[in-house]
């Protein structure tokens, strides 16, 4: 027989020879990192037809690391579902908990023994320090020193000393999130007051008031024969400016040859902004101004706006 077979889990005892005589026996032992469990044979004999009798390394089992239970409030997940050396153990924490220690442990061979590469981690409850205090405002649970995962606080503004109130800029409620970080930045409290919006050749149709504070919303329409340049709806933003800017009402230019369509109310250049569905005089179909062919006249965007709802 030629050299005996080689195996992943067991090795020949002694040095291999170039050839073996019929009836000659060779013995194997489990390799480092494997252990023998009887009764399977770990030897073979050179048969009379010059082949080795069947033998396998099934009796040699891969060393395993000791069982690790799930950390409290988490899970230990063996990669490939095995504790054998060369494999990993992954640790994950339940929602609201975070890992302290190694996220992955490796089953390693130390000498002939399989051991984990470190201590199993623990899952600690996510806790947040109190959220930031804000100028001119306060939050709920201000006396609490430690917040747990998903605990929420709500901010509110103090009464203002002057005639104009403080407005809350940002989200009023934030919560203790992953990694012990609050879900977003704290809001701010400040006086926000926009100037009275004036649109010549047009009029305000909603959002009436003497003062315009944060998030005040105003809508406009143009007088007959004028079209809206800009948005018909504006909002007072946190910088005390209107967003988008206050629109203008521009005169509808006469057509080059055809008469302009009869306008019941206003004309808009914006194809994205919709006017309110109804007003005092009923529905208002809105069109683009007709295209002018006269030199020197500005040329509006081409195409006709769909009539609005």
């Amino acid at each position: 027989c030629e050299e005996p077979p080689t195996f992943e889990a067991m090795e020949l005892i002694g040095k291999p020879k170039p050839y073996y005589e019929i009836g000659e026996r060779v013995d194997y032992k489990c390799k480092k990192g494997y252990f023998y469990i009887p009764p399977l044979a770990t030897h073979t004999i050179c048969d009379r037809n010059h082949t080795w009798l069947p033998v396998s390394d099934d009796a040699c089992y891969r060393e395993t690391c000791p069982y690790i239970r799930d950390p409290l409030n988490g899970q230990a997940v063996p990669a490939n579902g095995t504790y054998e050396f060369g494999y990993q153990m992954h640790f994950i924490c339940n929602e609201g908990y975070y890992l302290i220690g190694e996220e992955i442990l490796y089953c390693e061979l130390k000498g002939s023994v399989a051991i984990w590469s470190g201590k199993p981690p623990i899952c600690e409850k996510v806790l947040c320090t109190p959220p930031p205090k804000i100028k001119n405002g306060k939050h709920t649970f201000s006396e609490v020193e430690v917040f747990e995962y998903l605990d929420a606080v709500t901010y509110s503004c103090d009464p203002a000393p002057g005639p104009d109130p403080f407005s809350l800029i940002g989200e009023s409620t934030i919560y203790c999130g992953d990694n012990s970080v609050w879900s977003r930045a704290a809001p701010e409290c400040k006086v926000v007051k926009c100037r009275f919006p004036v649109v010549e050749n047009g009029k305000q149709i909603s959002g009436f008031g003497k003062k315009f504070y944060y998030k005040a919303t105003v809508m406009f329409e143009c007088d007959k024969g004028f079209y809206l340049d800009g948005s018909d709806t504006i909002v007072c933003d946190s910088n005390s400016t209107w967003d988008p800017p206050v629109p203008k009402c521009l005169k509808v230019l006469p057509p080059s040859s055809t008469k302009p369509p009869a306008l019941s109310h206003s004309v808009s250049t914006s194809s994205t902004t919709k006017s309110p569905a109804s007003s005092a005089s009923g529905p208002r179909p809105t069109y683009k101004p007709p295209v002018s062919n006269y030199p020197g006249y500005p040329k509006p965007e081409e195409g006709i706006l769909d009539s609005l709802d």
């Epitope: 469990i37 000791p66 069982y67 051991i115």
Partner: antibody
Framework: EVQLVESGGGLVKPGGSLRLSCAAS????????MSWIRQAPGKGLEWVSY????????YYADSVKGRFTISRDNAKNSLYLQMNSLKAEDTAVYYC??????????????WGQGTLVTVSS | DIQLTQSPSSLSASVGDRVTITCRAS??????LSWYQQKPGKAPKLLIY???RLQNGVPSRFSGSGSDTDFTLTISSLQPEDFATYFC?????????FGQGTKLEIK
């Protein structure tokens, strides 16, 4: 004082079913892994099944795999063992046992008084 | 599965004697071995875990030693209440297995 009290044992015919319960008190049940361990009359101890504190990890002895189901209800501080397709060799006293809390290794620090299951025609 | 073999299967001793029970594992289990005491009609009681750590409330006359495959439970001076059956259990890998037991009787 830690207490584990098993119930649900009795006489059942081969192929029949039985559900064992274990009521736990005196400790935070939801923090502990639990096991069922059995002992045939006059014989040694045989571990049957094991469940993690949350119920996400479960192990069974080969002799009961596919026939027995371990479960727990942390809200009720209770452990269960549903036993189906019972055989004569399942006859034993069944103990509910708590796993000690060390992170590595499994030992059973508290045991119930046991409930006898007899499988016989 | 990891097999545990206890020896002797039974032994007779007198009060005050020093007694040793051994447990051999079919493969290395480091120190993941526990010892239990069981009296007739009662549930087992944990004595030793992690091969040598004494469980709370267990008298100090009980001690455990060993690692890898060979382990020993020693009772330094037998008391009348120590006559019982003793089991070893491996906690290295599932399935958790027990030794066949050692019955300690009064001589």
């Amino acid at each position: 004082e830690v207490q584990l009290v098993e119930s649900g044992g009795g006489l059942v015919k081969p192929g029949g079913s039985l559900r064992l319960s274990c009521a736990a008190s005196g400790f935070t049940f939801s923090d502990y892994y639990m096991s069922w361990i059995r002992q045939a009359p006059g014989k040694g101890l045989e571990w049957v099944s094991y469940i993690s504190s949350s119920g996400s990890s479960i192990y069974y002895a080969d002799s009961v795999k596919g026939r027995f189901t371990i479960s727990r209800d942390n809200a009720k501080n209770s452990l269960y063992l549903q036993m189906n397709s019972l055989k004569a060799e399942d006859t034993a006293v069944y103990y509910c046992a708590r796993d000690i809390t060390d992170v590595v290794g499994v030992s059973f620090d508290y045991w119930g008084q046991g409930t006898l299951v007899t499988v016989s025609s | 599965d990891i097999q545990l073999t206890q020896s002797p299967s039974s032994l007779s001793a007198s009060v005050g004697d020093r007694v040793t029970i051994t447990c051999r594992a079919s493969r290395s289990i480091s120190t993941y071995l526990s010892w239990y005491q069981q009296k007739p009609g009662k549930a087992p009681k944990l004595l030793i875990y992690d091969a040598s750590r004494l469980q709370n409330g267990v008298p100090s006359r009980f001690s455990g030693s060993g690692s890898d495959t060979d382990f020993t439970l020693t009772i330094s001076s037998l008391q009348p209440e120590d006559f019982a059956t003793y089991f070893c259990q491996q906690s290295y890998n599932p399935p958790w297995t027990f030794g066949q037991g050692t019955k300690l009787e009064i001589k």
